[in-house]
Each structure stands twice: as C-alpha cells, then as structure tokens.
C-alpha cells in the first residue's frame, strides 16, 4: 500500500507539474472582481449586460448554476481551458484537491483582505462542478504562511 | 488537416492538424472520421500535455501525438485497409459541455493500392 | 436517432430524436452537416445553444431521451443532423438523420 501511495504522489506531482493552472487562477480572480463590480451597482439600476446569454434561464449545463459564463470572450476562454486542465485530474481526486490547494496558495499573495479570500476559496469549491467534473470530498484550502501538511 | 490523400494497404495513414491563431494549449483535440455517405466516428482525442485516450475499436493501431511549438496535432493509424477511406477531421474538444464545438475542413483519405 | 429521413417545407416545423442505451445524464450534443462540410455544432448538454447559432434550434430531454427542435425550418436548414453522447468513451454519434425538401 505505502508503494502504492508513493507511486501515486509520483504520479500526481508529475501531472501537476505539467498542468497549466493558469487558466483557472484568471477566471476565479476575473469572477470574484466581477461580482464585488455587481455588488456595488445600484440594485434597482436596469443595467443591460451585453454578454448575457440570450437563453433562457432553465436551459442549463448540468451540474451548475451557471458554467458557460459569456461575458466576454477572455473570461469563457480561461474557464474552457480551466475544466479542460482539471479534467486531467478526474479520475484521481486527492490529485485534483492538490491541483486546487495550488490554484489557492498562487493566488493567496493577490487576494485583499479575509472577505475576497472567502470569496476566492468559495468558487474554488465550487470550480470542479461548474466543468462538470465531481468536487474531491474533503480539501483543505486553508492557506498558512509556514506551510501545510495537505493529508 | 493536411496528409497525403492515398495510402497503400498495410501502410501507416499519417495527418496532421494546425490550429492557427489561438494556442492549442490547455485544450482537447478530437480526431473524427467519416467514410463516403456513412455517419461520424470518433477516432480518439489527446490532450496538449500528450495524455491521450483512443476509441477501443482502433486502439491496437491508433497514434496521437501534439506538438506545441508548431500548434499541430497528429494523428498515426497503422495497417489500414480499404475500410479506413474516409474524411478525417480533427476538432477541439471541451470538458465545459462535453462538446466539439471547433472543428477542421477535413481530409480525405483514399486506402488504395 | 429517429428518423432517418424526414421531408418538409421551409417554415415547418421539425423534430428529431436521439436515444441513448443507458442515462447518459444531459451530456449529449446536436451537430448539423452539410454535404462536403464539416459538422457544426448547435446544441450542447442536451439544451444549450452554441454561440451563433439561430434561436430556432432549440434541444430538450435528459437521462435517455432527448430532442432536437427546428422551430420554423429554413432554407439553410436543409442537412443532416447528428447526435453525440459526451457521458462516456469511447464518443459516439447517433447514424444521423437527413432533412430533405418535401
């Protein structure tokens, strides 16, 4: 079993490090400025966004609120290329919580303040399911300034 | 897509695919055959880290492979008969819907002796 | 897929089915080909409509049965249209059905 497990880390250190998780960061960091941008709007301002899909609202991928987010054409291309990558952890979740706990602690040093980290760790959770994809079970997201033991 | 349009039985059928301007970087790409008047198949699909995964039916024969410095897939099929003839497409391949929503003009392949 | 073959006029309307041998949840995609070209993607996980495509294609169902919808066919419309499951490997497409001119 311990060979096994080795085997396994070997594996998954050898995946993450060929995986581009770029594409992930600058969605979640575009999403979470996009809605602190609609928070402050004026609730009872009609403002029409150009990007929304003109569909109707129940025809839905499966699996999520709302995956194929249109809102401009760099946004959906990040998040395509995203579930594509994290697809590549799919049939190994301990794999895919690493690759999530990474995407955390690149982006730990850019979040401003316990309420955007909040936010950010938030959509993280929720990223695998919005591709379509199952969300590992149990994943600490916790960020600490001297290091983490993930298991 | 681009190959040579005859290949000799029992030879290698060899195409290749160029994705201009956008990187095939962090994408699937699918490869999808068709012979003359018949319905689609899909051949298999690579991921541009080279991970791939093959149809069952033409995995014993079936080579993908990336390059991404020249922004081309590739895909090798050995021993071919008469019943690989058929156009070849390739198409990007998405996890986000499950779909193959870019696909190539597509290349005919005549097995020919 | 059902049918294989169906005839109509421009302004009908047209429904094709597709089903699938097990629940393949809404993973299935519609593609629409026309002779000589490549196929072209209209409908993805089962109802959502691909970036640029009319709003006269519309698609429904779940689990295994599934529909693709052309509200008021057009000229253009006039093709073969493919299912394709995404639940599973390997894809695989339904053997299409052909739109012709009544």
């Known amino acids: 079993r311990q060979q096994w497990e080795l085997q396994g880390d070997r594996r998954c250190q050898s995946q993450l490090e060929r995986a581009n998780l770029r594409p992930c960061e600058q969605h979640l960091m575009q999403k979470i400025q996009r809605d602190e941008d609609s928070y402050g709007r004026d609730p009872y301002s009609p403002s029409q966004d150009p990007y929304s899909p003109s569909q109707d609202p129940d025809r839905r991928d499966p699996y999520s609120p709302s995956p194929y987010d249109r809102r401009g054409a760099g946004s959906s291309q990040h998040q395509e290329r995203c579930c594509n990558e994290l697809n590549e952890f799919e049939n190994n979740q301990r794999c895919m919580c690493e690759a999530l706990q990474q995407i955390m602690e690149n982006q730990s040093d850019r979040l401003q303040g316990r309420q955007q980290e909040q936010q950010f760790k938030r959509e993280l959770r929720n990223l695998p399911q919005q591709c379509g994809l199952r969300a590992p079970q149990r994943c600490d997201l916790e960020v600490e300034s001297g290091g983490r033991d993930r298991y | 897509e681009s190959g040579p349009g005859l290949v000799k039985p029992s030879e290698t059928l060899s195409l290749t695919c160029t994705v201009s301007?956008?990187?095939?970087?962090?994408?699937?790409w699918s490869w999808i055959r068709q012979p003359a008047g018949k319905g689609l198949e899909w051949v298999g699909r690579?991921?541009?880290?080279?991970?791939?995964t093959y149809n069952p039916s033409l995995k014993s024969r079936v080579t993908m492979s990336v390059d991404m410095s020249k922004n081309q897939i590739s895909l090798n099929l050995s021993s071919v008969t008469a019943a690989d003839t058929a156009v070849y497409y390739c198409?990007?391949?998405?996890?986000?819907?499950?779909?193959?929503?870019?696909w190539g003009q597509g290349t005919t392949v005549t097995v020919s002796s | 897929q059902s049918p294989s073959s169906v005839s109509a006029s421009v302004g009908d309307r047209v429904t094709i089915t597709c089903r699938a041998s097990q629940d393949i949840s809404s993973w299935l995609a519609w593609y629409q080909q026309k002779p000589g070209k490549a196929p072209k993607l209209l409908i993805y996980?089962?109802?959502s409509l691909q970036s640029g495509v009319p709003s006269r294609f519309s698609g429904s169902g779940s689990g295994t049965d599934f529909t693709l919808t052309i509200s008021s066919l057009q000229p253009e419309d006039f093709a073969t249209y493919y299912c394709q499951q995404g639940n599973s490997f390997p894809r695989t497409f339904g053997q299409g059905t052909k739109v012709e001119i009544k």
């Open positions: 996980t089962a109802s």
């Open positions: 301007g956008d990187s095939i970087r962090s994408y699937y």
């Open positions: 690579i991921f541009t880290t080279g991970s791939t």
């Open positions: 198409a990007r391949d998405q996890t986000l819907g499950r779909r193959m929503d870019v």
